[in-house]
């Protein structure tokens, strides 16, 4: 009998407090060999799946869930889980996404976060700096 799968982690870039209209990317991380990640809202009735996985570090894989332009409807609690070898993991801790104006936002635009896993890693899909034109990410209405 295989042991329990490690719990995934969840984070948000550039942070968990986002002004309305700004983008946010929720990042889910799990072990090597994850086939699918799922991002769920608190009530579990709304979720988004992806099989577009990256190599985040020697011991981790990750998936990214982007919302182009957040609104009040995107605020709330999110958590991740994943499938590995046909088994579902436990849920991650909750991430609380807050949508509110912060001081100075109208004067200083939020910088888009770099998608690399860190300066010491060679994640598979960040080793090239080629990207398609900055097309729409996952819009709020598509996400939930």
């Amino acid at each position: 009998q295989e042991g329990p799968l490690p719990r995934p982690s969840i984070s948000a870039e550039p942070g968990t407090v986002i002004p309305p209209g700004r983008p946010v990317t929720i990042v889910c991380r799990g072990p090597v060999g994850v086939d699918q990640f799922r991002l769920e809202r608190e009530d579990r009735s709304k979720f988004n799946d992806t099989k577009d996985v990256s190599q985040a570090s020697p011991s981790e894989s990750e998936a990214r869930f982007r919302i182009d332009s957040v609104s009040e409807g995107n605020a709330g609690h999110y958590r991740c889980l994943y499938v590995k070898s046909t088994r579902w993991s436990e849920h991650s801790d909750y991430l609380d996404l807050v949508v509110k104006e912060t001081s100075g936002d109208t004067d200083s635009p939020v910088t888009e976060p770099d998608s690399s896993a860190g300066p010491t890693q060679r994640p598979s899909d960040n080793s090239h700096n080629e990207h398609a034109p900055a097309s729409q990410g996952l819009s709020a209405e598509h996400l939930y």
Epitope: V32, D52, S61, R66, S124, E130, L138
Partner: antibody, heavy 120, light 107 residues
Framework: EVQLVETGGGLVQPKGSLKLSCAAS????????MNWVRQAPGKGLEWVAR??????????YYADSVKDRFTISRDDSESMLYLQMNNLKTEDTAMYYC???????????WGQGTSVTVSS | DIQMTQSSSSFSVSLGDRVTITCKAS??????LAWYQQKPGNVPRLLIS???SLETGVPSRFSGSGSGKDYTLSLTSLQSEDVATYYC?????????FGGGTKLEIK
């Protein structure tokens, strides 16, 4: 059942162009990264290009041998993958496979391929 | 780019033999290694991912091992249907790269 059907191959002269298409069915296309892999006659496998999903801004990646000549694209509404090949060279002669990956790069599902011959 | 080297391009083997195919990466690929089987005239088939994980439907006589730069595909008892060319591939970093292939032939 996952199905990937490539079309668009054929005979083309050096410096010519060709556009390959791949019709995907049997799975949720828009949540998967997709690839093109090729195999020259009697030779090994060579990864050509990859395109990620909307969550990742449709980021694209290319082998050095095709960079600036080939363009990978997708149409999620039609579950189609494309490879636009320009300035073709004789060394681009190969069977071209449309491939859906798993686990972030293992090539799990392959089409039957479409043959491209570059010759004068 | 990461180079993948399969030291033997072909093997002449007998049915029932244990077969070991090796693959060496030019740098650490952290177990992001896949093995494929390609029979003559057929499309490649994924056998193993993450160096050791057997794909669904792959016979248990196949197994994968290794870590760091060095990886191995093993067949415990060669069957006639295993005659094929076997490729390794790293997916730690783009560009993804394949080994040159190892062809198994029957003596």
């Amino acid at each position: 059942e996952v199905q990937l059907v490539e079309t668009g191959g054929g005979l083309v002269q050096p410096k010519g162009s060709l556009k390959l298409s791949c019709a995907a069915s049997g799975f949720t296309f828009n949540i998967n990264a997709m690839n093109w892999v090729r195999q020259a006659p009697g030779k090994g496998l060579e990864w050509v290009a990859r395109i990620r999903t909307k969550n990742n801004n449709y980021a694209t990646y290319y082998a050095d041998s095709v960079k600036d000549r080939f363009t990978i694209s997708r149409d999620d509404s039609e579950s189609m993958l494309y490879l636009q090949m320009n300035n073709l060279k004789t060394e681009d002669t190969a069977m071209y496979y449309c491939v859906r990956d798993r686990y972030g790069g293992a090539m799990a599902y392959w089409g039957q391929g479409t043959s491209v011959t570059v010759s004068s | 780019d990461i180079q993948m080297t399969q030291s033997s391009s072909s093997f002449s083997v007998s049915l029932g033999d244990r077969v070991t195919i090796t693959c060496k990466a030019s740098e650490d690929i952290y177990n992001r290694l896949a093995w494929y089987q390609q029979k003559p005239g057929n499309v490649p088939r994924l056998l193993i991912s993450s160096a050791t994980s057997l794909e669904t439907g792959v016979p248990s006589r196949f197994s994968g091992s290794g870590s760091g730069k060095d990886y191995t595909l093993s067949l415990t008892s060669l069957q006639s249907e295993d005659v094929a060319t076997y490729y390794c591939q790293q997916y730690w970093t783009i560009p993804y790269t394949f080994g040159g292939g190892t062809k198994l032939e029957i003596k």
